[in-house]
C-alpha cells in the first residue's frame, strides 16, 4: 500500500477550501490537531478538521445529494409536466370543439330548437370537462339530463309546434315519457357507453400523468438521513481533513454508499416500471370508443341521428304522449 | 342529413386556413410520450449509478479515497475499508423507506391497479355488443376512422385528428376576457382561434 502523503503542516490548503464553503468562519485549526472529538472523519493521525467543520461538511454533503437527485430527475420531470399540460389543454380543446360542432348542428338543422339546445349542450359539455378533471358527476346522469332537457323542446317545437302556451306545463311529463317510451331509441344508451368509456380512460390517463409528477416531486425533495449524511461526508469530504484535496472517491465505494443512501428510493423501482408499462397498455387501448377525441367529436352526428329517430316515429309518439300527458296536472308521470 | 361541422361556420363565412403540413393527433402524441417514458423505465434502479457518475469519482487516477485512506483504485480495499467501524450498511438498508416514499408507493400501486383494470381485455367485451344492439347503423368497416352513431344518410365518419396547428373553430360561447364584464352576447360571426399547443421534446 502506498504511504499517504504527509498532511499539510499548516492546514492552509484546507482553510482556503473551507473558506469557500463557509466564508468568514474560523473553524479550521491553524495546524493539524488530534481530532479526538470527531465523529465521522475518524483520524488515523493528526487532522485539519474540527467538529464544527464536520457538521458543516455533513450539511453540505446532504445538500449536494439533494441537488444531484434533482438534476437527475429534471429531464423526466419536465417531460411529464409538459405532457400533462399539453394533454389537459388538448382535452379542453376537444370538448370545446365537440360543443361547437353540436351547437352548429342544431343551428343548421334545427334552428327552432336554439337557443335552448345551446344551453343544454353547453351544460352537458361543462359536465364532460368537469368529469375529466375529477368531479364525481355520473356520466349516465349527464347523458340522461341532456336528453331529458332536449325532448320537451323537440316535442313542443318540432313534433307539436301548434301546442298552445297553456299546455307547456307538460314538460315534467315529457321528461318522464322520454325514458319510459325510449323516445330516442337506443341512442342515449349508445352515447352513455361511448362517453363513459372514453372519459373514464381520459380521466385515468391524466390522473396517471399527475401522479407521475407527484412521484418525481416526492423523490426530488427527499431529506436524507443522518446516517446517509455521515456516509456521504466520509466519501466526499473526510479526505480533505488529511489535506488530500485532489483525491476522488473510489467508484465501487461510491456505489456502495449510494445504494445505502438510496435503499428506500430504489424500492420505488418495481412500481415505477409497472406504472410505465401499465400506462403503455392503457395508451395502446385508447382508440375507437376508448378515444375521447373520436367519441366527442362525433357526438353531434349521433345526437342528430337520435333526433331523426324521434322525427321518424313522430306520429306514433305524438299520439301516445298526447294520451299520457293530457292529464299531467293530476298525474305527474315520473 | 347533418352537415359536417367544418362546413358549418355561421353565415357561411369562407375561412382561409393555412395549409397544415404536419397534422399531429392526440394518439400519436400519447404514443410518443410512452416511448420517451420507456427510456426512463430504469430511472429509480439506475439512480445510485447516475449520481456516482455525476459526482467526483476516481476514473483515471491510480489512487482513490475509500472513506478512510488513500488506496489503489483496483484493490479490494477500494470498496470495503471505508465502511469498517462506521455503522452497519445493512442496517441502513433494513430501516425501510421513508414514510413519504411508502405513501407514494401506495399511490403507485393504486394507479397501477386502476390502469390495469382499464386496459383489461375482458373490459372490452362490451365493444362487440354495441354493434349488435341494432341502432339501425350500417357497417362502418374496421379502418382507423370511427363510425359513431349513424342512421342512413346521417352517418358520418369522424377523422381521429385534432389539429394542433392553425386551428379555427366557431365558438358560440360568450368569450369575454376575465374582468371584462360589460354587456356581451354571442355574435353570429364570431370566430375564435385556438392556439398552438406546441411540441414537447
Amino acid at each position: 500500500q502506498p504511504p499517504p502523503p504527509p498532511p499539510d503542516a499548516t492546514c492552509h490548503q484546507v482553510r482556503s477550501f473551507f473558506q469557500r464553503l463557509q466564508p468568514g468562519l474560523k473553524w479550521v485549526p491553524e495546524t493539524p490537531v488530534p481530532g479526538s472529538d470527531l465523529q465521522v472523519c475518524l483520524p488515523k493521525g493528526p487532522t485539519c478538521c474540527s467538529r464544527k467543520m464536520e457538521e458543516k461538511y455533513q450539511l453540505t454533503a446532504r445538500l449536494n445529494m439533494e441537488q444531484l437527485l434533482q438534476s437527475a430527475s429534471m429531464e423526466l420531470k419536465f417531460l411529464i409536466i409538459q405532457n400533462a399540460a399539453v394533454f389537459q389543454e388538448a382535452f379542453e380543446i376537444v370538448v370545446r370543439h365537440a360543443k361547437n360542432y353540436t351547437n352548429a348542428m342544431f343551428k343548421n338543422n334545427y334552428p327552432s330548437l336554439t337557443p335552448q339546445a345551446f344551453e343544454f349542450v353547453g351544460e352537458f359539455f361543462t359536465d364532460v370537462s368537469l368529469y375529466i378533471l375529477g368531479s364525481d358527476i355520473n356520466v349516465d346522469d349527464m347523458v340522461n339530463e341532456l336528453f331529458d332537457s332536449l325532448f320537451p323542446v323537440i316535442y313542443t317545437q318540432l313534433m307539436n309546434p301548434g301546442l298552445p302556451d297553456s299546455a307547456l306545463d307538460i314538460n315534467e311529463c315529457l321528461r318522464g315519457a322520454r325514458r319510459d317510451l325510449k323516445v330516442f331509441g337506443n341512442f342515449p344508451k349508445l352515447i352513455m357507453t361511448q362517453v363513459s368509456k372514453s372519459l373514464q380512460v381520459t380521466r385515468i390517463f391524466l390522473q396517471a400523468l399527475n401522479l407521475g409528477i407527484e412521484v418525481i416531486n416526492t423523490t426530488d425533495h427527499l431529506k436524507f438521513s443522518k446516517d446517509c449524511g455521515r456516509m456521504l461526508t466520509r466519501m466526499w469530504y473526510c479526505s480533505y481533513c488529511q489535506g488530500l484535496m485532489m483525491v476522488k472517491p473510489c467508484g465501487g465505494y461510491c456505489n456502495v454508499v449510494m445504494q445505502g443512501c438510496m435503499a428506500g428510493v430504489v424500492e420505488i423501482d418495481k412500481y415505477w416500471r409497472e406504472y410505465i408499462l401499465s400506462l403503455e397498455e392503457l395508451v395502446n387501448g385508447m382508440y375507437r370508443i376508448y378515444d375521447m377525441e373520436n367519441v366527442l367529436l362525433g357526438l353531434f352526428s349521433t345526437i342528430h341521428d337520435s333526433i331523426q329517430y324521434v322525427q321518424k316515429n313522430a306520429g306514433k309518439l305524438t299520439t301516445t304522449i298526447g294520451k299520457l300527458c293530457a292529464h299531467s296536472q293530476q298525474r305527474q308521470y315520473r | 342529413s347533418a352537415y359536417y361541422p367544418e362546413d358549418l361556420f355561421i353565415d357561411k363565412k369562407v375561412l382561409k386556413v393555412a395549409h397544415v403540413e404536419h397534422e399531429e393527433t392526440l394518439s400519436s402524441r400519447r404514443r410518443e410520450l410512452i416511448q420517451k417514458l420507456k427510456s426512463f423505465i430504469s430511472f429509480y434502479s439506475a439512480l445510485p449509478g447516475y449520481i456516482c457518475s455525476h459526482s467526483p469519482v476516481a476514473e483515471n487516477d491510480t489512487l482513490c479515497w475509500n472513506g478512510q485512506e488513500l488506496v489503489e483504485r483496483y484493490s479490494q480495499k477500494a470498496a470495503r475499508n471505508g465502511m469498517k467501524n462506521q455503522f452497519n450498511l445493512h442496517e441502513l438498508k433494513m430501516k425501510g423507506p421513508e414514510p413519504v416514499v411508502s405513501q407514494i408507493i401506495d399511490k403507485l400501486k393504486h394507479i397501477n391497479q386502476l390502469l390495469r383494470t382499464m386496459s383489461m381485455p375482458k373490459g372490452r367485451v362490451l365493444d362487440k355488443n354495441l354493434d349488435e344492439e341494432g341502432f339501425e347503423s350500417g357497417d362502418c368497416g374496421d379502418d382507423e376512422d370511427e363510425c359513431i352513431g349513424g342512421s342512413g344518410d346521417g352517418m358520418i365518419k369522424v377523422k381521429n385528428q385534432l389539429r394542433f396547428l392553425a386551428e379555427l373553430a366557431y365558438d358560440l360561447d360568450v368569450d369575454d376576457a376575465p374582468g371584462n364584464s360589460q354587456q356581451a352576447t354571442p355574435k353570429d360571426n364570431e370566430i375564435s382561434t385556438f392556439h398552438n399547443l406546441g411540441n414537447v421534446h
Epitope: I80, I81, A84, A85, Q88, E89, E92, I93, V95, R96, K99, F118, E119, F120, V121, G122, E123, F124, F125, T126, D127, S129, L130, I132, L133, G134, S135, E145, S149, L209, N210, L211, I213, E214 | D173, V174, D175, D176, P178, G179, N180, S181, Q182, Q183, A184, T185
Partner: antibody
Framework: EVQLVESGGGLVQPGGSLRLSCAAS????????RSWVRQAPGKGLEWVSA????????YYADSVKGRFTISRDNSQNTLYLQMNSLRAEDTAVYYC?????????????????WGRGTLVTVSS | EIVLTQSPATLSLSPGERATLSCRAS??????LAWYQQKPGQAPRLLIY???NRATGIPARFSGSGSGTDFTLTISSLEPEDFAVYYC?????????FGQGTKVEIK
C-alpha cells in the same frame, strides 16, 4: 355599472337555515355560470357552490353537499344559496362571484367579478 | 383535492420594492392557476389567470409565471395600494381550490 350585491346574512343557531341572495346588474346574467365562495374569519377562500348559466347544472363542495342548495332566477337576475343544517364551521363571509366563462364553458373556474360579501354567523 | 401552499405567509416590504410571491401545488395544475388580490373589508379581485395572463384593467407591474407545480406572482415595484393579501387558485382539478394567502405589508 357592473356589480353583484349579496344579502340575507345574519346570526343563526346551529342546525338552523338561512337563504342568501345575490342581485346582479350591468351584464347578461343568464350567460354566465355563477358561484358562491366563502371566507371564514381570518382564513382563506373556499369555493362552495356553482350553478350553470341556464340553471340546469349545480355543483357543490363536499363540505356542503346535501345541506346547501344553489339556484337562480334569470328573470330577476338573482342568485340564491339556501343553507340548511348550518354548523359553526359554516361561519364566514359569503361572496357571490361570476365565473369567468359563459354557460357551457370547458371548465373555466376562475372568478372575475365578486360582490362585497354577506356575513353568516352560526352560533348558539 | 389539490392543496395550494403559498409562501411566505407574510412579506414585509417598502413601496418601490419588488415583491415575489410563491404558490406550490400538491400536484401538477398545468398552467391553470389564477392570482387574486384582497384588501381588508373588500372582495377579492382577479389579477392573473392561466398563470401569466393579466385580467382586464390590471396594471403591468403585476406579472405571473410558472407551470406544473410551482408558480410566482411578481409585483415589479410596489405601490401603496398593492399592500394586501394575495391568493392563488387552481382550476386544473375538481374542485377549484385556493391557497391560504400571502400578506404583503408595509415594512
Amino acid at each position: 355599472e357592473v356589480q353583484l350585491v349579496e344579502s340575507g346574512g345574519g346570526l343563526v343557531q346551529p342546525g338552523g337555515s338561512l337563504r342568501l341572495s345575490c342581485a346582479a346588474s350591468g351584464f347578461t346574467f343568464s350567460s354566465y355560470a355563477r358561484s358562491w365562495v366563502r371566507q371564514a374569519p381570518g382564513k382563506g377562500l373556499e369555493w362552495v357552490s356553482a350553478i350553470s348559466g341556464g340553471g340546469g347544472r349545480t355543483y357543490y363542495a363536499d363540505s356542503v353537499k346535501g345541506r346547501f342548495t344553489i339556484s337562480r332566477d334569470n328573470s330577476q337576475n338573482t342568485l340564491y344559496l339556501q343553507m340548511n343544517s348550518l354548523r359553526a364551521e359554516d361561519t364566514a363571509v359569503y361572496y357571490c362571484a361570476k365565473n369567468y366563462y359563459g354557460s357551457g364553458s370547458a371548465s373555466y373556474w376562475y372568478f372575475d367579478l365578486w360582490g362585497r360579501g354577506t356575513l353568516v354567523t352560526v352560533s348558539s | 383535492e389539490i392543496v395550494l401552499t403559498q409562501s411566505p405567509a407574510t412579506l414585509s416590504l417598502s413601496p418601490g420594492e419588488r415583491a415575489t410571491l410563491s404558490c406550490r401545488a400538491s400536484q401538477s395544475v398545468s398552467s391553470y392557476l389564477a392570482w387574486y388580490q384582497q384588501k381588508p373589508g373588500q372582495a377579492p379581485r382577479l389579477l392573473i389567470y392561466d398563470a401569466s395572463n393579466r385580467a382586464t384593467g390590471i396594471p403591468a407591474r403585476f406579472s405571473g409565471s410558472g407551470s406544473g407545480t410551482d408558480f410566482t406572482l411578481t409585483i415589479s415595484s410596489l405601490e401603496p395600494e398593492d399592500f394586501a393579501v394575495y391568493y392563488c387558485q387552481q382550476r386544473s382539478n375538481w374542485p377549484p381550490t385556493f391557497g391560504q394567502g400571502t400578506k404583503v405589508e408595509i415594512k
